[in-house]
């Protein structure tokens, strides 16, 4: 799901699943602004005042970010340039599932998408030879 | 093999114009933005001019502002410098270059001369 | 804009030698630096990315460090083919801008 048009920049954002106890990664992407300090990213989740994470001028901020995602949201800042705006979660939760809104502003204008994430005890499907 | 290859430079008078092209093979070029960066003789390096991958974001350098126009037609895999009212000092060699967390692939470059 | 200026201009070193370049920004870039190297007659060469990211196929005896307004390119031990002039570059901003350039000569 994605915005676009006049004063609109495309979000693109996919569907994800997460390991309860692991990290795991909301993705999405944007077509980059070269001027990188003009580029805002902001997770937000359904439900929840204020942030899962902010990312402006080049770099986290994180003064209104709610407290359940304290000490455990990254983005990729050196894969912003080419417009990674994915969200890194540290030690994934049951409560944790919901939808999540990724949020870009650039020169150009803004934009942005919706994801659906899943947290659960997934594990791989052994093989028996 | 990644390869940008630049063509379309030479000797021009002050006043006049020229369309420098570069040719990309060996990636999807339009998932990557592009630069042009040139080097006068004996000089050091100068970004010249910027594009993303779909065009929605264009910059210039403010020495070739109103006279060069960036373009690219992902369609021909092909990024383009057009450059109206050459000077003096644009005299320089013009390398295309692919834009990922750095310029990470440069082409071999092209010679724009401007001289009477 | 944002400035960018090397130091030193020019330095003459050995084989072996562990050599170190710096690079200074007019205002914060973060770590929004990139370092190339150019050797006469061709293109420039990534070295490193944000700040200290080794491009790969980069031998690992480059490594770059820094963030703010302060950074550093070091050869850990210099060899033949790294005798060349080093750029650093910021694209925290536009426009992008190079620092003037650093000449490694043999001594």
């Known amino acids: 799901f994605g915005i676009s048009g006049k004063h609109f920049i495309t979000v693109t954002t996919f569907t994800s699943a997460g390991n309860i106890g692991e990290d795991g990664t909301l993705s999405c992407t944007f077509e980059p602004d070269i001027k990188l300090n003009g580029i805002v990213i902001q997770w937000l989740k359904e439900g929840i005042k204020g942030l899962v994470h902010e990312f402006k001028e080049g770099k986290d901020d994180l003064s209104q970010q709610h407290e359940m995602f304290r000490g455990r949201t990254a983005v990729f800042a050196d894969q912003v340039v080419v417009g990674n705006a994915s969200l890194r979660l540290k030690n994934v939760q049951l409560t944790d599932a919901g939808t999540y809104t990724c949020y870009i502003r650039t020169s150009k204008g803004k934009g942005n998408a919706n994801l659906e994430y899943k947290t659960g005890a997934f594990s791989m499907p052994e093989i028996n030879v | 093999e990644v390869q940008l290859l630049e063509s379309g430079g030479g000797l021009v008078q002050p006043g006049g114009s020229l369309r420098l092209s570069c040719a990309a093979s060996g990636f999807t070029f339009s998932s990557y933005g592009m630069h042009w960066v040139r080097q006068a003789p004996g000089k050091g390096l100068e970004w010249v001019a910027s594009i993303s991958s779909s065009s929605g974001y264009i910059y210039y350098a403010d020495s070739v502002k109103g006279r060069f126009t960036i373009s690219r037609d992902n369609s021909k895999n092909t990024l383009y410098l057009q450059m109206n009212s050459l000077r003096a000092e644009d005299t320089a060699v013009y390398y295309c270059a692919r834009a990922s967390s750095g310029m990470d692939v440069w082409g071999q470059g092209t010679t724009v001369t401007v001289s009477s | 804009d944002i400035q960018m200026t090397q130091s030193p201009s020019s330095l003459s070193a050995s084989v072996g030698d562990r050599v170190t370049i710096t690079c200074r920004a007019s205002?914060?870039?973060?770590?929004?630096l990139n370092w190339y190297q150019q050797k006469p007659g061709k293109a420039p060469k990534l070295l490193i990315y944000?700040?200290?990211s080794l491009q790969s196929g980069v031998p690992s005896r480059f490594s770059g460090s820094g963030s703010g307004t302060d950074f550093t390119l070091t050869i850990s031990s210099l060899q033949p083919e790294d005798f060349a002039t080093y750029y650093c570059q910021q694209y925290y901003s536009t426009p992008l801008t190079f620092g003037q350039g650093t000449k490694v000569e043999i001594k």
């Open positions: 205002q914060s870039i973060r770590s929004y």
């Open positions: 944000y700040a200290s």
